[in-house]
Interface confidence: medium
């Protein structure tokens, strides 16, 4: 018997070192995966049993010959994948019976030459992959054929020239994608693309195109249907007004010029591309943008300048420069990414003219933006910005009114900086529509009563690992945030808070309070009694109190928190939990108590929260394997559908001595009083 796995109508026989086709698979399979074996042939007679096959994948084998009768035996075959084999020749007969094929993958074989018309009968073919084969010509046949072809992949071959007579076989095709990447192209002969019925996307990445060849290419694309042109990873060191001039008579909408070591973007380089909507200039070496660099891009919606500029060297003069008004022509631009650059700072008119901009990413963009002032973003005053990413910019101070120009902003990300200040609240002046402020991973933030008084619309506030100070002031800094649904105060070593810290936050759904120091606040011996800072949070869904040193949970602290779905109390020092503390948590889905000091799991504590649990984590607790301590728990474990991972290995008895290291689930409860499962 074979070791193939069969699920529904799919047989997976991959990676089995097969030298022959298995003969005992179900006869109704429609998909057969034979990849990564040691097959040398696909004998047609061996497939007689599998006449329902629609997809046959025999990639990554050692097949050197294909017999025409295979498709006769498999009349419903639509996808044939033979990539990474040893086919060296295909003749007129090879696919003669494969009339119903829609996809044929011959990538990574040794087909150096196409003789005559091996694809003449493939009138249903929509995808043909001949990349990585050593072909020296695009000619796949004489006479018009492959009229339904949509994707022709010829990357990584040895094609030196594109000639009209070698592409005329595509005269009736509407190619959605022609990939000629990684070919050493040196010539685009006149009319070479005109012979293709329609060509919508052309990929010429890594094709060693210089500026002159690029210009020639664009003229050959003139008056075609081209919409998407990818010229990434060439040697397009400079562009000028003439580089893309041939594209004037096209409706090009996407252009990828990434990874070109592009140094000089000449004025008017894009002036002939009024239909362009997407432009990528990622990973280049641009020295300067001037007010006419983007002239003509009147319909551009998306522009990526990620890592597009010169990297700084010893000389300060090598700093890339973005002149004022460089973006002034991009009146429909909605998305601008300038991540990972070495721009010194913003100027008063850096972003002027971007009157449709919604998403601006400036992560790790600036070298001298330590202080944000009310001038930093003045050039965005007329932009309807919704999202602003300012992460990783070594920002240390935010001045009052910095964001006052951004009245429509919804998401402000200031994480992963070095902000070190007292938040007066004036920093956020004017952010009247703000939804989320992300401040996590900064140096030091001191709160005041008015820190967030000017942003009542805020729904998400992230303050993780910011050495937060003054959390215990009254009234609470969070009091104005009536709409808050997510609050992250984790990793701040907070030890002192008041009972009214979260008062009035009735809409809070997620509270992250892990990695703080709340242990004293929940002790009975705490002066003034335990601090119940969770009261009134009636819509709380997720509560994380991991790693807080907690060794007590006061009675009533979870009372009325009926909507709690997840509680994480892992990595604390909890031992004996009071009865009934989880009585209102009957809707709980996830409970994490791993790495505590829990010895007993009793019904009056855990019965209610276990009722509807999907997931329980109580690993690494020192369970006391006695009837009183765990018989109810063991019985529950053995009849529940709750997911309890690593139950066999990480739920082990600690006491009594003779049970040490014994798996909890194997504890025999039959001799325990009142242990019957129906008691649950």
């Amino acid at each position: 018997t074979n070791q193939c796995t069969v699920r529904y109508n799919v047989a997976d026989c991959s990676h089995l070192k097969l030298t022959h086709i298995p003969d005992d698979l179900p006869s109704n399979i429609t998909v057969l995966n034979l990849t990564h074996n040691q097959l040398r042939r696909l004998p047609p007679t061996n497939f007689t049993r599998y006449s329902q096959l629609a997809i046959l994948d025999a990639g990554f084998n050692s097949i050197s010959k294909l017999e025409p009768e295979l498709c006769q035996i498999l009349p419903l075959l639509k996808v044939l994948n033979l990539q990474h084999n040893e086919l060296s020749q295909i003749s007129d007969q090879t696919f003669v019976f494969c009339t119903n094929l829609t996809e044929l993958d011959l990538m990574s074989n040794s087909i150096h030459k196409i003789k005559s018309n091996p694809f003449k009968n493939q009138k249903n073919l929509i995808k043909l992959d001949l990349s990585h084969n050593g072909l020296s010509s695009t000619k796949l046949g004489t006479g018009v054929q492959l009229e339904n072809l949509q994707e022709l992949l010829l990357a990584k071959n040895k094609i030196l020239a594109l000639r009209s007579e070698e592409l005329e076989f595509l005269g009736n095709s509407s190619l959605r994608k022609l990939d000629l990447s990684s070919n050493p192209l040196k010539e685009f002969s006149p009319g070479c693309f005109q012979t293709i019925g329609k060509l919508f996307a052309l990929l010429l990445n890594n094709a060693q195109l210089n500026p002159h060849l690029t210009e020639k290419l664009c003229w050959e694309l003139s008056n075609t249907s081209i919409q998407n042109l990818s010229l990434a990873n060439n040697q397009l060191l400079a562009t000028s007004e003439s580089t893309f001039s041939g594209l004037k008579w096209t409706n090009l909408t996407q252009l990828d010029l990434s990874y070109n070591n592009l140094h000089d973007v000449g004025n008017g380089s894009f002036s002939y591309l009024p239909s362009l909507r997407y432009l990528s200039l990622e990973y280049n070496n641009i020295q300067r943008l001037s007010p006419r660099s983007f002239y003509g891009l009147s319909n551009l919606r998306y522009l990526s300048l990620k890592r597009a500029f010169t990297k700084q060297s010893v000389s300060l003069a090598s700093h890339p420069n973005i002149d004022d008004f460089s973006f002034q022509w991009l009146k429909y631009l909605e998305y601008l990414n300038m991540d990972d650059n070495n721009i010194p700072s913003t100027k008063s008119n850096t972003f002027t003219g971007l009157v449709s901009l919604k998403y601006l990413s400036l992560s790790k963009t600036f070298t001298s933006l330590q202080t944000l002032t009310n001038e930093t973003f003045v050039s965005l005053a007329h932009s309807p910005l919704l999202t602003l990413n300012l992460t990783k910019n070594h920002i240390s101070k935010i001045a009052n009114g910095t964001f006052s120009w951004l009245g429509q902003l919804r998401i402000l990300d200031l994480g992963l900086n070095e902000i070190e200040q007292k938040l007066s609240g004036q920093e956020w002046r004017g952010l009247r529509n703000i939804f989320e402020i992300y401040l996590s991973y900064n140096k030091y933030l001191q709160l005041s009563t008015s820190s967030f008084a000017l942003v009542p619309s805020l729904q998400r506030l992230m303050l993780r690992r910011v050495a937060l100070k003054n959390v215990d002031i009254s009234p609470s800094p969070f009091r104005p945030l009536r709409n808050l649904t997510i609050l992250d105060l984790s990793n701040n070593n907070i030890a002192n808070i008041n009972e009214d810290l979260l008062e009035g936050l009735e809409n809070l759904e997620i509270l992250d309070f892990q990695h703080n120091n709340l242990a004293r606040l929940w002790k009975r011996a705490n002066p003034g009694g335990p601090v119940n800072f969770l009261k009134g949070l009636s819509h709380l869904h997720i509560l994380n109190l991991e790693s807080n040193g907690l060794d007590e949970i006061p009675v009533g602290v979870f009372k009325n928190l009926f909507e709690l779905k997840s509680i994480n109390l892992g990595l604390n020092n909890l031992n004996k939990l009071e009865p009934f503390i989880f009585d209102d948590q009957t809707s709980l889905r996830s409970l994490n108590l791993q790495k505590n000091l829990i010895t007993s799991v009793e019904k009056d504590v855990f019965g209610p929260p276990f009722q509807n649990l999907n997931s329980l984590d109580m690993r690494f607790n020192p369970f006391d394997c006695t009837c009183e301590s765990i018989s109810w728990f063991v019985n529950w474990i053995n009849q529940t559908h709750t997911n309890i991972s690593e139950l066999s290995t990480h739920y082990l008895c600690n006491t009594p001595h003779h049970y040490y290291g014994f798996p909890l689930k194997l504890f025999d409860t039959s001799s325990c009083k009142d242990s019957a499962p129906f008691e649950l």
């Epitope: 429609t30 629609a54 997809i55 994948d57 639509k78 009138k123 929509i126 339904n148």
Partner: nanobody, 115 residues
Framework: EVQLVESGGGLVQAGGSLRLSCVAS????????TGWYRQAPGKQRDLVAE???????IYADSVKGRSTISRDNAKNTVYLQMNSLKPEDTAVYFC?????????WGQGTQVTVSS
């Protein structure tokens, strides 16, 4: 990702007609081959009819002359018109599309032919 939703099944008298529809979302029908298969209780799933990008069609012998497969690219829909129905046509009818090397199936629609 392609989603297929069949409709049009039901209970019909022998000799009657039905028109099954299959709507695809996520990928237009102009790409690839689209077919109808059927599975009677306790039997394997068998091809009924299939239509190709070129417009070519193929039919199982058991339905030839009684069924017509067609498609409307604008509506992303493929149809199976079945006439002169027989009790042996009773089955769950499934729509099938092959897209970029993946075999997609609908949930099926029940056709019951009573005598």
């Amino acid at each position: 990702e392609v989603q297929l939703v069949e409709s049009g099944g039901g209970l019909v008298q022998a000799g009657g007609s039905l028109r099954l529809s299959c709507v695809a979302s996520g990928s237009p029908f102009s790409i690839g081959a689209t077919g109808w298969y059927r599975q009677a209780p306790g039997k394997q799933r068998d091809l009924v009819a299939e239509i190709y990008p070129s417009g070519d069609t193929i039919y199982a012998d058991s339905v030839k002359g009684r069924s017509t497969i067609s498609r409307d690219n604008a509506k992303n829909t493929v149809y199976l018109q079945m006439n002169s129905l027989k009790p042996e046509d009773t089955a769950v009818y499934f729509c099938n599309v092959v897209r970029w090397g993946v075999d997609y199936w609908g949930q099926g629609t029940q056709v019951t032919v009573s005598s």
